[in-house]
């Protein structure tokens, strides 16, 4: 049975086996085509989601689709139902929390009262002044809180208490990539993790431990990427894995927050990386223990210099490392989070690519998560 499952796939009507390598190869090998059903699927980037959250205290902003202008949501008459609608528009299904925050002196958007129309937030037509003088601060999910704060050092062993959103993504029980829990159903990782194996069946997620082999595996229902362009294989290196059953959160299994749309991190901003990847370039083996390291944002211009990545780092990517080199993500860390701590931990990057590991002029390159918020929200909405 184990051998059969490992090398063959059972087609129905009529029942017969096909070699497992024929799964997800673009050819219908089973009469009903079920060999092409449970495969990595691509999902287009899609339209702009008409709500977003700002790094200014997680305040809600709403798009006026007629003009293309964004407005800040006034707290006047804002209700739990409106909060739920806003979060649902971003694809969240959990119960949101919201509160009033004072309109700040730097408020540069017009403030409008919000209403609802066919399950979408709208601006109230006859919106007068914002009488409360407050904006809506909205949290769609409790996220980004860990039991333990890491100490700032170079590279050291990590505890799952510090990083309860870190998961191991495994194919045939072998660790391939890292990933981050975003909510009970969804894990964020890199698309390139799935280039070699596009069948969903054999992929599993392991959560809740800092040791590679020691925790139960979770079944995966779907793997979703943006359409792959083989001519630019490093682009759009982002994937969402939908778990078959929702996670139960605990001290060691918790979600990390998505970044705010306007999360612009300046060079030298401190960040953290974690993973079970190689401890040295071409070092041949994964670390059994989760490792953590502090790094910093490296300016994209510097990263694109002639002695570095020569223009390959796009505006949807970011670089992080330490100026002198020596601290970096490596093979096996792919898909894991690049994290920033404000009030909560945010996944600002996904470990994507780089030349070697830890070189001074070639730091790690990460998918910039804020560039893909629309895509994430559109995927989630389609799967609600």
């Amino acid at each position: 049975k184990v051998i059969l499952d490992k090398y063959y796939f059972l087609c129905g009507q009529p029942l017969h086996f096909i070699p497992r390598k024929q799964l997800c190869d673009g050819e219908l090998d089973c009469p009903l085509g079920e060999d092409e059903e449970h495969c990595v699927k691509s999902f287009p980037e899609g339209p702009a989601v008409a709500v977003r959250l700002s790094k200014d205290r997680s305040t809600l902003q709403v798009l006026d689709s007629a003009t293309g202008n964004w407005f800040s949501a006034c707290f006047d008459n804002f209700t739990e139902a409106l909060a739920e609608t806003a979060c649902r528009q971003m694809g969240y299904s959990s119960k949101p929390t919201f509160r009033a925050v004072e309109i700040g002196p730097d408020q540069d958007l017009d403030v409008v009262e919000i209403t609802e129309n066919s399950q979408e937030l709208r601006m109230r037509n006859s919106s007068g002044p914002c009488l409360s003088g407050s904006l809506v601060s909205l949290h769609c999910l409790a996220c980004g809180k860990s039991l333990k704060t890491p100490r700032v050092v170079g590279v050291e062993e990590a505890s799952v208490d510090s990083w309860p959103w870190q998961v191991s993504i495994q194919y045939d029980k072998q660790h391939v990539c890292g990933g981050s829990i975003l909510d009970p159903h969804w894990v964020l990782t890199a698309a390139h993790c799935f280039r070699k194996h596009t069948d969903v069946f054999n992929w599993k997620v392991r959560a809740g431990s800092d040791k590679l082999g020691s925790f139960p595996s979770l079944a995966v229902a779907k793997i979703i990427i943006i359409e792959f362009n083989p001519m630019y294989p490093k682009d759009n290196d982002i994937a969402l894995m939908k778990l078959q059953f929702p996670l139960t959160f605990s001290g060691t299994v918790r979600p990390i927050c998505l970044p705010f749309f306007d999360e612009e991190l300046t060079p030298a901003t401190p960040l953290w990386i974690i993973g079970w990847g190689f401890t040295k370039q071409n070092g041949g083996k994964m670390s059994d223990i989760l490792l953590q390291a502090s790094v910093q944002v490296i300016d994209s211009t510097r990263c694109n210099a002639d002695d570095a990545y020569q223009g390959e780092v796009t505006e949807k990517m970011m670089c992080a490392g330490i100026p002198e080199g020596g601290v970096d993500t490596c093979q096996g860390d792919s898909g894991g989070p690049l994290m920033y701590q404000s009030d909560q931990w945010h996944v600002v990057g996904i470990v994507s690519w780089g030349y070697g590991c830890g070189g001074p002029s070639t730091p790690g390159v990460y998918t910039k998560v804020s560039a893909y918020l629309n895509w994430i929200y559109n995927v989630w909405k389609a799967e609600l």
């Epitope: 280039r195 083989p230 001519m231 630019y232 294989p233 490093k234 223009g311 390959e312 690519w353 030349y355």
Partner: antibody
Framework: QVQLVQSGAEVKKPGSSVKVSCKAS????????MHWVRQAPGQGLEWMGG????????NYAQKFQGRVTITADESTSTAYMELSSLRSEDTAVYYC????????WGQGTLVTVSS | DIQMTQSPSSLSASVGDRVTITCQAS??????LNWYQQKPGKAPKLLIY???SLESGVPSRFSGSGSGTDFTLTISSLQPEDFATYYC?????????FGQGTKVEIK
């Protein structure tokens, strides 16, 4: 810096095959898409196919499907393009080209098909 | 396949002129557009990749713009060495396709 060095000119008989090589240096050969493009005398550029060595799978233009084979040898950082069942209208300069930033083209290989 | 329509097919200009060449894709290609320069008997040379990124070593008088379906290559002040044929190429989808070329000649 990036360099693509192609094999020399070839004169071939109709019905035969030609294999053009393209040796890459100055970048990570496996990670970038390599195109094969041809240009008939006085004409524009025509894409034939391409490959990304790390994934090993080649793509081909419909027009050349079944007649062209593109391969890559990671150990020597060399890409190959083989065109079979040659006819006189295949007389052209054949180029390999790296996609993206530092997108560089080989110097070209003239293939003349004549009886 | 995505069609790339380049215009004009040829133009005459003088040294110092500002020259604009346009390229239109038959469907949305985001910013996956390259511009090449080719001189007689030579291989094409990349000028602009991803619609607006200037290739290393290319003079700053060359610039590219556009996104979606409409793209432009601009030479701000034409130099003697710029007389050549220019091609656009989409690399959004397989098969990548080229425009038919724009020949820039001396007036």
């Amino acid at each position: 810096q990036v360099q693509l060095v192609q094999s020399g000119a070839e004169v071939k008989k109709p019905g035969s095959s030609v294999k053009v090589s393209c040796k890459a240096s100055g970048y990570t050969f496996t990670d970038y898409y390599m195109h094969w493009v041809r240009q008939a005398p006085g004409q524009g550029l025509e894409w034939m196919g391409g490959i990304i060595p790390i994934f090993g799978t080649a793509n081909y233009a419909q027009k050349f499907q079944g007649r062209v084979t593109i391969t890559a040898d990671e150990s020597t950082s060399t890409a190959y393009m083989e065109l079979s069942s040659l006819r006189s209208e295949d007389t052209a300069v054949y180029y390999c080209a790296k996609e993206g930033a530092n997108g560089y083209w080989g110097q070209g290989t003239l293939v003349t098909v004549s009886s | 396949d995505i069609q790339m329509t380049q215009s004009p097919s040829s133009l005459s200009a003088s040294v110092g002129d500002r020259v604009t060449i346009t390229c239109q894709a038959s469907q949305d290609i985001s910013n996956y557009l390259n511009w090449y320069q080719q001189k007689p008997g030579k291989a094409p040379k990349l000028l602009i990749y991803k619609a607006s990124s200037l290739e290393s070593g290319v003079p700053s008088r060359f610039s590219g713009s556009g996104s979606g379906t409409d793209f432009t290559l601009t030479i701000s002040s034409l130099q003697p060495e710029d007389f050549a044929t220019y091609y656009c190429q989409q690399s959004s989808r397989i098969p990548p396709t080229f425009g038919q070329g724009t020949k820039v000649e001396i007036k």
